[in-house]
Interface confidence: medium
């Protein structure tokens, strides 16, 4: 991942195009890897991650992983390619503009994960279904 202070540039190594041949630009995501968190029993939380990074690859999206076990709560924020599994799970919601947490089955812990495709969208992680939009894909067309 490129450090946040580095200016974006498009060179031959970075050029990725969509189906129409348009250039896709790398996304900005919160990227603090795994950190202890106080986020618990809330409808939504901020990541409290102060590092905004330019994702290494243009196809990468923002991901957040919330985990709770008997000892602690952690929040992981990263960039990741949605074509590849993360923590053995497919990023089903990678096109969403918002990071809406979905619970995944993991033995011995409570495990929630979300992914999203707007800049720094993994800064605001949402647990409550009432935060769901009527059509996140269409919102993505309008705002991202």
């Amino acid at each position: 991942t490129i450090p946040p202070h580095v200016q974006k540039s498009v060179n031959n190594d970075m050029i990725v195009t969509d189906n129409n041949g348009a250039v896709k630009f790398p996304q900005l995501c919160k990227f603090c890897d795994v950190r202890f968190s106080t986020c618990d029993n809330q409808k939504s939380c901020m990541s409290n991650c102060s590092i905004t990074s330019i994702c290494e690859k243009p196809q990468e999206v923002c991901v957040a992983v919330w985990r709770k076990n008997d000892e602690n709560i952690t929040l992981e924020t990263v960039c990741h390619d949605p074509k590849l599994p993360y923590h053995d799970f497919i990023l089903e919601d990678a096109a969403s503009p918002k990071c809406i947490m979905k619970e995944k089955k993991k033995p011995g812990e409570t495990f929630f994960m979300c992914s999203c495709s707007s800049d720094e969208c993994n800064d605001n992680i949402i647990f409550s279904e009432e935060y769901n939009t009527s059509n996140p894909d269409l919102l993505l067309v309008i705002f991202q």
Epitope: K8, A22, V23, F25, P97, I126, D137, L140, V141, F143
Partner: antibody
Framework: QVQLVESGGGLVQPGGSLRLSCAVS????????MSWVRQAPGKGLEWVSA????????HNTDSVKGRFSISRDNSKNTLYLQMNSLRAEDTAVYFC??????????????WGQGTLVTVSS | DIQMTQSPSSLSASVGDRVTITCRAS??????LNWYQQKPGKAPKLLIY???SLQSGVPSRFSGSGSGTDFTLTISSLQPEDFATYYC?????????FGQGTKVEIK
């Protein structure tokens, strides 16, 4: 500095066509979704149409579906709105605006100065 | 579509007054609410996004609050350049919709 400059407005008869353009400078055009928002004389703002950053997806408000078509040329930093089968109720100032999605917060900023479309016989 | 209703439609105030404009959504929109200022013949200008975040370059006399369905824009001390029309806009669901506007006039 960021600039959005609309052009192509004018007087057209009902049933006629116009093509609006929005020339953009000061930011990486191909990284942002863009929208058209209109304002009828003395009235409020109405979102009309949007296109994704790469141009592969677009969405129109119901009242213009099948009549208006949004497109963009990222190599020319230009947004377009092709308006066909125009009606009197399409008379408005048309603004182009940059769509922003940051931390799940969605808004339009900045906006162009607008171009007036008048549909009248 | 989500309907946005502003009140009042217009108000008269003097320089230095505290002005409050309200915006109500027809359903919960969390904090996906933006405020714009528009002067005659000009483009709308973003003031507040996400209900309470002040856009860069906007004077601190402007503030926003609210969540769910009820939102407020406050101008703590009205200045001559603040006489304009103000619009709220929800960006929670498609299509994005605006309030009808509140015109702030000189008393």
């Amino acid at each position: 500095q960021v600039q959005l400059v609309e052009s192509g407005g004018g007087l057209v008869q009902p049933g006629g066509s116009l093509r609006l353009s929005c020339a953009v400078s000061g930011f990486t055009f191909g990284r942002y979704a863009m929208s058209w928002v209109r304002q009828a004389p003395g009235k409020g703002l109405e979102w009309v149409s949007a296109i994704s950053a790469s141009g592969d997806r677009h969405h129109n408000t119901d009242s213009v579906k099948g009549r208006f078509s949004i497109s963009r040329d990222n190599s020319k930093n230009t947004l377009y709105l092709q308006m066909n089968s125009l009606r009197a109720e399409d008379t408005a100032v048309y603004f182009c605006a940059k769509g922003i999605a940051k931390s799940g917060k969605n808004y339009f900023d900045p906006w162009g100065q607008g171009t007036l479309v008048t549909v009248s016989s | 579509d989500i309907q946005m209703t502003q009140s009042p439609s217009s108000l008269s105030a003097s320089v230095g007054d505290r002005v409050t404009i309200t915006c109500r959504a027809s359903q919960s929109i969390s904090s996906y609410l933006n405020w714009y200022q528009q002067k005659p013949g000009k483009a709308p200008k973003l003031l507040i996004y996400a209900a309470s975040s002040l856009q860069s370059g906007v004077p601190s006399r402007f503030s926003g609050s609210g969540s769910g369905t009820d939102f407020t824009l406050t101008i703590s001390s009205l200045q001559p350049e603040d006489f304009a029309t103000y619009y709220c806009q929800q960006s929670y669901s498609t299509p994005p919709t605006f309030g009808q506007g509140t015109k702030v006039e000189i008393k």
